[in-house]
Interface confidence: low
Amino acid sequence: APVRSLNCTLRDSQQKSLVMSGPYELKALHLQGQDMEQQVVFSMSFVQGEESNDKIPVALGLKEKNLYLSCVLKDDKPTLQLESVDPKNYPKKKMEKRFVFNKIEINNKLEFESAQFPNWYISTSQAENMPVFLGGTKGGQDITDFTMQFVSS
C-alpha cells in the first residue's frame, strides 16, 4: 500500500511561519497577508516506527520538491538539514531513520522529535528570521512547539 501523506504548514508557538532560506535551509519569521504564500508546504508522510497514542512517526518532505528534513551528525552534533532524495523512491513506508520524526501531541501543540537522536527536536529561535534547527533542549529559550494547518491537495 502506498504511504499515507497529507499536506500542511507549520507555525511555531509564537506564530512564526517557516519559509525557504536558500536551497537547503528553512527559517522562521512572522508573515502577514500575501506574504503567507511564501511559507513552506510540507507533505507529511506517516511512516513505519514505534507508535503510541500521542506519538506518531512521520517524515517531513517539501511538497512537490524532492527534499526531506533529515537529522545527521555534523561536527559530532545532531543537525537538521534538507536532504535531496530520488523522487522515484520517496516517500516510502520504511523511511531511513534520519528522515523520521516522532510527532508528539501535547496540549494541542506538536513537537517533532528526531527518531535518530532521541530528545532532539525541530526548533526555532525566539529571534526573527533565524534558521530552523535541531535543538537538544525543551522548555528553554528555543521553541519546540508547533501548530499544524492542513492544506488541501
Partner: antibody, heavy 121, light 112 residues
Framework: DVQLVESGGGLVQPGGSRKLSCAAS????????MHWVRQAPEKGLEWVAY????????YYADTVRGRFTISRDNPKNTLFLQMTSLRSEDTAMYYC??????????????WGQGTSVTVSS | DIVLTQSPASLAVSLGQRATISCRAS??????????MQWYQQKPGQPPKLLIY???NVESGVPARFTGSGSGTVFSLNIHPVEEDDIAMYFC??????????FGAGTKLELK
Amino acid sequence: DVQLVESGGGLVQPGGSRKLSCAASGFTFSTFGMHWVRQAPEKGLEWVAYISSGSYTTYYADTVRGRFTISRDNPKNTLFLQMTSLRSEDTAMYYCARDDYDVSNYVMDYWGQGTSVTVSS
Amino acid sequence: DIVLTQSPASLAVSLGQRATISCRASESVEYYGTSLMQWYQQKPGQPPKLLIYAASNVESGVPARFTGSGSGTVFSLNIHPVEEDDIAMYFCQQSRKVPSLTFGAGTKLELK
C-alpha cells in the same frame, strides 16, 4: 589497512589505576566513534564504553560508570580508557573497536588485538 | 538491559554440514524496520571479527556461507557448508538499547 593497537595493560593492585591507549591508523580517526570492550579469561565479551567522533557523547556500562573514563585525542589518532578503583572483576583483555555508525546502529567493525589487565594483590 | 541468550553453548558439526546458532533477546531489538543485531566470530587468541550486521547483512569480505536471519527477538546465524576455518566462538550483540550494548554468552563451534 585499518589498524588498532592497544597498550598500557599490566598488573595492577586492587583499588589502583591504569590508563589504556589505543593507537589508530589506516582511517580518518576523527570521523568515527570508538568503543572499549573487555573479555575476562575464558568468558564472553562485555561492552565497556563508547565515545563519539568529537567526544560529544560518551556512554558507559553500569559496571564501570563512575570508575572508568573514555577519552580521545583526535590529532594524535589515539583513544584512551582511564581506569580507577580497579577490582579483581576488572581483570580482562581490553579491546578497542571502531564503531561503524550506521543509522544509530552501534556495530564494531574493526578490533585491536587487545591489552591484558590483571587486578591482583 | 536486553539479555541475549545464545543456544547451544557448544555445537559439534561435520565438515560440509550446516551449523545453526540461535540468539534470543529478552525484548525486541527492532527499530524503525531494522533489527539491530550483529554476529561476531572469535578464534582462540584473536579479537572478535564482525560477520553480520543488522541481522542479515553480511560484512564485506565475509564468505557467503555465513548468513543471518531473524527479527524481533529471535535470530540465527547459519554456516553452510562448515569449513575447518570456521571453528571458533560466535557471539551475538544487540544495539537496540543504547547506551547499554550487550553480547550473548557465546557458542563454541567444534568439529565432529
